[in-house]
């Protein structure tokens, strides 16, 4: 029967008896950074190509027996898992290995950095269609391997990492931190982050999404039609790479940026059970199990839209977290979270001509978050218009005035130390949904877009009493792309998007005080583009 | 030991065309900075990536390697040139005493230098 | 649940030879480094030796250099250390212990066996 | 194998905090992880504290570790009965290429 990892990974419509997706990933090719591999396996026999490429320390250890199973294991069963006869996940797709680790599974970032090069040279000498870099390996936070990463990934390279296996948070660890890579952790059968002994699966916002990675079946370097089961982000990195070869294989054109949304767009959501992370990473934690998409056409009409929440400000009393998008997709909106509930919200500002998410501490906070909510909008001219404080009563408010650009986002952001938790809150009067409001004390940001089709509408969940969180969705066909909180009063600790939610969530009831003080909106803006939609009408 | 033996050989004698000094100081007001592994056994002391701004040519990346062994030489250090960047990011891998740090990063076109470190499989 | 149970207590002349067990449960075997730790009565906890996962390395500390050998069987999960020419002063407690995690955290040890009484009497 | 240096004993009541310290040198400490284990009367050590400062699950967050230098410390805060055990740092040793472990630190919860 079908092992458990491929059928996770199968859309329902697809699942029976034999994995047999409908493109197995042939017209891309997989470069794998491992140890050395057992290329007359069965499994992976004809499908790869060991390279010249050797860049290894020497072992540890004062008495140390090579012996060519042993140094091969790791690789050989990563190569079984993206391209495998029997059990691989897109077996239609030709590989090439790298050796940049020992027989121990050691490595060096030096050795590393010269096998990237090494990909990018073969890339410009001999132009073949899309690639694939699987790295399912891990150091500590290196610039300069993050860097390499960076630059291979805007040369068009697709680079797929684990997150690592050390229970922490991926961002400590090198190629998981680098935001250009697609960074994998690991669940099991249950949909559980994965635990090895006492350490597990890596957490946190570098993570982009989890996929299998325990007791996964492939090759076995014993013997050539020998299989053996292993565990590890490695492993889930490797379905990532096999899904992202045939999704490649379907549509080759795919950008980096376009190949991540729909990762995130067709994973399972909310299935992993986050009480296994620390607290503090849950929120930053994408809940999400990587999956083939349900059909390898036609996703071109959806408007694609991820979270992207940046690091941790600090404490200082003027502090900031800066949230920044991938360079092919457009900032929609910003928001910002802070657990003690001291911020001065946030703000969309220009960087290096791209616009940036910013959030702001306040005095006596424990610091912010930013978080960016971006989108694949194409031919997408976006700017943001800013109303300063009002000092009226009825607070401040700012909307679109350009012909043909839609509110696709609102952000506030206050000088204040503390908005006044006595002041009413404002609620915006019916029948102008261009229109950002909010706090009298507070500046407005208003994120207009102009784009082919493009339509928004806003969606708000009020509750008048108390309530640590408040939610509004998008239903099907519209994408969440701007997510904020009326009032902007200080017990609300801040507002961010989960998927297609918007969720702004409130401090402890009981420290809340009175009902009124207590109300809450989750606003919502949701859009879709009818222009996406009639190409690929077209295309059909 | 033979080989390395045989590379200061090499460098004693290349050393009587590079001029002394900096002749090209780095740019006014850009300092280079150092980085290292958090997880110090993690590091590996005694090997750096010197990673030059992102213009810089094949040949600049040589020169300034050479520059570096000269210099180096001159204060009775060994060091190795283990290799050239180029396609990716410009700079070099270069074996030396953290005690030539401070020189190398006053080189010019040195952006920063990162101490190596282990990769582990996952 | 996850443990390591050791072979019975062993009372030995000196001189003589003994092989001490540790049989895993619960975990896979084979993806874990082992160490042995042994502890004298009323001393501290001494560090005999480490072997890698795959058995292909390994460590011993110098007193246990060229008389003890560590080994293992992965497929019987079993974990052993062979201990020659005994000295009284090698009566301990002897515990085995898992290795944390792959190479780069192979030096904690996160579960203990309930250790084996090892009394070297004449 | 020479071990790292720890105090023979400390003590307080229940509800303070105690630190035990560990010293050894730039092939141990100073450039390697430090594990912390506590070991009951008459049973096997267990892991409180690894790389520094990381608590396996199950561990309550009293128990916090540090590293100043070629110092760790390991600290018990909200002392509890339950605590009274015999405590050993670890670590690595890269001149040694051996673990070596402290020589132990007996805490007594007083009253």
């Known amino acids: 029967s079908i092992p458990w990892n491929l059928e996770r990974i199968t859309p329902p419509r697809y699942r029976a008896d034999e994995y047999q997706p409908p493109d197995g990933g042939s017209l891309v090719e997989v470069y794998l950074l491992d140890t050395s591999i057992q290329s007359d396996h069965r499994e992976i026999e004809g499908r790869v190509m060991v390279t010249d490429f050797e860049n290894v320390p020497e072992e540890d250890g004062t008495r140390f027996h090579r012996q060519a199973s042993k140094c091969d294991s790791h690789g050989t069963h990563l190569a079984g898992v993206v391209s495998g006869r029997d059990a691989g996940v897109a077996k239609g797709a030709s590989m090439r290995s790298l050796r940049v680790l020992n027989c121990q599974g050691k490595g060096t970032v030096s050795g590393t950095l010269i096998g990237l090069e090494f990909i990018r040279k073969s890339q410009l000498v001999q132009p073949v269609g899309p690639l694939v870099v699987l790295l399912p390996l891990a150091g500590g936070y290196s610039r300069v391997l993050n860097a390499a990463c960076q630059r291979l990934a805007r040369a068009g390279v697709v680079l797929v990492t684990a997150a690592g296996n050390f229970r922490d948070d991926a961002c400590l660890y090198s190629p998981a931190s680098a935001p250009e890579v697609i960074t994998v952790g690991a669940t099991n059968a249950q949909d559980q982050p994965v635990t090895l002994g006492t350490l597990g699966t890596n957490f946190g916002r570098c993570v982009d999404l989890f996929a299998p990675g325990e007791d996964i079946i492939g090759a076995s370097s014993h013997c050539s039609t020998c299989f053996v089961s292993q565990s590890g982000t490695s492993q889930a990195a490797a379905h990532v790479a096999g899904i992202a070869a045939m999704m490649l294989s379907a549509e080759p054109e795919l950008t980096l940026a376009e190949l991540r949304q729909r990762l995130i767009h067709f994973s399972a959501k909310d299935v992993i059970n986050e009480a296994w992370f620390p607290e503090d990473q849950r929120v930053l934690t994408p809940n999400l199990v990587a999956a083939l998409p349900p059909s390898t056409h036609g996703a071109g009409w959806q408007l694609f839209c991820r979270t992207v929440w940046s690091a941790h400000s600090g404490p200082t009393r003027m502090a900031t977290a800066v949230a920044r998008c991938a360079p092919d997709e457009e900032l929609l909106s910003c928001s910002s979270f802070s657990r003690s509930g001291k911020r001065r919200g946030e703000r969309m500002e220009a960087q290096g001509g791209k616009l940036v998410c910013r959030a702001h501490n306040a005095f006596g906070g424990e610091g912010v978050y930013a978080i960016a909510r971006c989108c694949l909008l194409p031919q997408a001219n976006c700017s943001v218009h800013t109303a300063p404080p009002a000092e009226a009563s009825m607070g401040t408010r700012v909307h679109c005035h350009q012909q043909g650009h839609v509110l696709t986002g609102c952000s506030s952001h206050w000088e204040v130390e503390d908005l006044g938790t006595h002041k009413p809150p404002v609620l915006r009067p019916r029948g102008q949904p261009n229109q950002c409001v909010g706090h009298r004390e507070a500046s407005i940001h208003a994120s207009c877009c102009h784009a082919p089709g493009l339509e928004c509408k806003v969606k708000e969940h009020g509750i008048p009493a108390p309530q640590e969180q408040v939610t509004v969705a998008c239903e099907e066909g519209w994408t969440l792309t701007g997510c904020s909180a009326l009032p902007g009063t200080s017990h609300v600790l801040g507002a961010y998007a989960v998927d297609n939610t918007c969720v702004v969530r409130s401090r402890d009831v009981s420290t809340t005080g009175s009902t009124s003080e207590g109300a809450v909106t989750a606003v919502a803006i949701c859009c879709r583009s009818r222009h996406l939609a009639q190409a690929s009408q077209e295309l059909q | 030991q033979e080989d390395e033996d045989g590379d200061y050989e090499e460098l004693v004698l290349a050393l009587r065309s590079e001029e002394d000094g900096l002749a090209e100081a780095p740019e006014h007001g850009t300092t280079a900075t150092f980085h290292r592994c958090a997880k110090d056994p993690w590091r590996l002391p005694g090997t750096y990536v010197v990673v030059l701004k992102e213009e810089t040519h094949l040949s600049q990346s040589e020169r300034t390697a050479r520059r570096l062994q000269a210099q180096a030489a001159r204060r009775g250090y060994l060091t190795k040139i283990l290799h050239v960047f180029h396609g990716l990011l410009p700079g070099f891998l270069v074996k030396m005493s953290g005690d030539l740090l401070e020189l190398a990063l006053k080189l010019p076109h040195v952006d920063y230098i990162e101490e190596d470190s282990s990769v582990f499989a996952q | 649940q996850v443990q390591l149970v050791q072979s019975g207590a062993e009372v030995k002349k000196p001189g003589s030879s003994v092989k001490v067990s540790c049989k895993a449960s619960?975990?896979?075997?084979?993806?874990?480094?082992m160490h042995w730790v042994r502890q004298a009565p009323g001393q501290g906890l001494e560090w005999m030796g480490l072997?890698?996962?795959?058995?292909?390395?390994?460590y011993y500390a110098d007193s246990a250099k060229g008389r003890f050998t560590i080994s293992r069987d992965n497929s019987k999960n079993t974990l052993y250390l062979q201990m020659n020419s005994l000295r009284s002063d090698d009566t301990a407690v002897y515990y085995c212990?898992?290795?944390?995690?792959?190479?780069?955290?192979?030096?904690?040890?996160?579960?203990w066996g309930q250790g084996t009484t090892v009394t070297v009497s004449s | 194998q020479s071990a790292l240096t720890q105090p023979p004993s400390v003590s307080g009541s229940p509800g303070q905090s105690v630190t035990i310290s560990c010293t050894g040198t730039s092939s141990n400490i100073g450039n390697q992880f430090v594990s912390w284990y506590q070991q009951l009367p008459g049973t096997a050590p267990k892991l409180m504290i690894y790389?520094?400062?990381k608590r396996p699950s199950g561990v309550p967050d009293r128990f916090s570790g540090s590293k100043s230098g070629n110092t760790a410390s390991l600290t018990i805060s909200g002392l509890q009965t339950g605590d009274e055990a015999d405590y050993y740092c670890?670590?690595?040793?890269?001149?040694?290429?051996?673990?070596?472990f402290g020589t132990g630190t007996r805490v007594t919860v007083l009253g």
């Open positions: 619960a975990f896979t075997f084979d993806s874990f480094g």
């Open positions: 790389e520094y400062n």
């Open positions: 212990a898992r290795a944390m995690g792959a190479i780069y955290y192979y030096y904690a040890m996160d579960v």
């Open positions: 670890g670590s690595w040793d890269s001149s040694l290429s051996g673990y070596v």
């Open positions: 072997l890698w996962s795959d058995g292909s390395g390994e």
